[in-house]
């Protein structure tokens, strides 16, 4: 039994890191393998992650971690019984994929303005709480070409757009994702989408 693709890990910079790797053949990850991990820290202890299958030869492990700080470094040991298959390390702050924003809501009761709000996925004491920026994707269910992205580079988790920038009388969907420039993170997954019917009063034409 050998590792074909070494584990690569990403952290949500909060409490979970996800590591994925591939073996050289079909493997029952949960019964044959264990991933041991430990924070390099005086007050830390070793933890064991039981991997799950991710395709025939692929394995994935969800590592429960202490709140992350930038200096953290974890040692990783991949075992098959008594055999050490791979040894490595992982700095969560260098491989961050933020959590997806939640609770996306479209408020349509403001006159001719759409207000989109969502929740920051981090608690206020987390470093990323004040460092996330967002991308909001709005698209028409009727017209695949009617697809737009709004970059929200301020900290407030909201976006205002004129209802008239979208077509009236049809349904739209929106979703939002996050990233943090400070740690050069990847984008988060998209939030679940939300749907609304766009309608607004057309302005009277002047003759």
């Amino acid at each position: 039994m050998k590792v074909l693709q070494e584990p690569t890990c990403v952290s949500d910079y909060m409490s979970i890191s996800t590591c994925e790797w591939k073996m050289n053949g079909p493997t029952n990850c949960s019964t044959e393998l264990r991933l041991l991990y430990q924070l390099v820290f005086l007050l830390s202890e070793a933890h064991t992650c039981i991997p799950e299958n991710n395709g025939g030869a692929g394995c994935v492990c969800h590592l429960l971690m202490d709140d992350v700080v930038s200096a953290d470094n974890y040692t990783l040991d991949l075992w098959a019984g008594q055999q050490l298959l791979w040894k490595g390390s992982f700095k969560p702050s260098e491989h961050v994929k933020p959590r997806a924003p939640g609770n996306l809501t479209v408020h349509t009761n403001v006159s001719d303005t759409l207000l989109l709000t969502w929740s920051n996925p981090y608690p206020p004491d987390n470093y990323l709480y004040n460092h996330l920026t967002y991308a909001v994707n709005i698209w028409s269910e009727n017209d695949p070409a009617d697809f737009r992205i709004y970059n929200v580079t301020y900290l407030e988790p909201s976006l205002r757009i004129a209802a008239s920038t979208l077509k009236s009388g049809i349904s739209y969907r929106a979703r939002v994702r996050a990233w943090a420039q400070c740690y050069n993170t990847t984008w988060s997954e998209w939030s679940p989408s939300t749907k609304w019917h766009n309608s607004y009063r057309e302005p009277f034409e002047q003759h």
């Epitope: 409490s15 390099v40 820290f41 005086l42 007050l43 830390s44 202890e45 971690m65 202490d66 709140d67 700080v69 930038s70 200096a71 953290d72 608690p123 206020p124 004491d125």
Partner: antibody, heavy 115, light 109 residues
Framework: EVQLVESGGGLVQPGGSLRLSCAAS????????MFWVRQAPGKGLEWVSG???????SYADSVKGRFTISRDNAKNSLYLQMNSLRAEDTAVYYC?????????WGQGTLVTVSS | EIVLTQSPGTLSLSPGERATLSCRAS???????LAWYQQKPGQAPRLLIY???SRATGIPDRFSGSGSGTDFTLTISRLEPEDFAVYYC??????????FGQGTKVEIK
């Protein structure tokens, strides 16, 4: 908002015991290492003890064998059991959250060891 | 055990002046594990700088940290009245734990 509130300080005779408590709120207590740091009157800061999320502990040489740090994650509380107290243990005792450094501190509780 | 020595013991300056505080370690310290704190009379210490040069949340940009190895510096570019306080450096070591310098008092001249 992160809050750490110490209690349990007071006047105790040399050789006596005292138990300090720290009530934590505003963060996930169970995922953070916690510490006690003290400051003798007019002196500098001295790290006393720390406890990791899994219960691993460490102590300064000056208190080893006399002080015991513990935590109750269900109650979001940190404790310091201080036995065989000496005059040189007189200090303000701060509860702090952190790891390699201490990012949040309580306001401290005064322990006076005197006959 | 790593010993941190801060200098000067007291720094007498006027508001608007630049303050330069030094922290010297008895052996090499990882920059990732060097921090600075501010403490005012009757108050708990407050984290200013971690990782030798990163400002903690809410700390004004007039505070900056630098250095590596055994020599570290905290600089206050223009002293404000609220900056007069005692400043401590602190390091973490995987075997010895956490130690503080003895402090530098920044007082009004």
């Amino acid at each position: 908002e992160v809050q750490l509130v110490e209690s349990g300080g007071g006047l105790v005779q040399p050789g006596g015991s005292l138990r300090l408590s720290c009530a934590a709120s505003g963060f996930t207590f169970s995922r953070n290492a916690m510490f006690w740091v003290r400051q003798a009157p007019g002196k500098g800061l001295e790290w006393v003890s720390g406890i990791g999320t899994g219960g691993a502990t460490s102590y300064a040489d000056s208190v080893k064998g006399r002080f015991t740090i513990s935590r109750d994650n269900a109650k979001n509380s940190l404790y310091l059991q201080m036995n065989s107290l000496r005059a040189e243990d007189t200090a303000v005792y701060y509860c702090a959250r952190g790891r390699y450094y201490f990012d949040y501190w309580g306001q401290g509780t005064l322990v006076t060891v005197s006959s | 055990e790593i010993v941190l020595t801060q200098s000067p013991g007291t720094l007498s300056l006027s508001p608007g002046e630049r303050a330069t505080l030094s922290c010297r370690a008895s052996q090499s310290v990882s920059s990732s594990y060097l921090a600075w704190y501010q403490q005012k009379p009757g108050q708990a210490p407050r984290l200013l700088i971690y990782g030798a040069s990163s400002r903690a949340t809410g700390i004004p940009d007039r505070f900056s940290g630098s250095g590596s190895g055994t020599d570290f510096t905290l600089t206050i570019s223009r002293l404000e009245p609220e900056d007069f306080a005692v400043y401590y450096c602190q390091q973490y070591d995987h075997s010895a734990g956490w130690t503080f310098g003895q402090g530098t008092k920044v007082e009004i001249k």
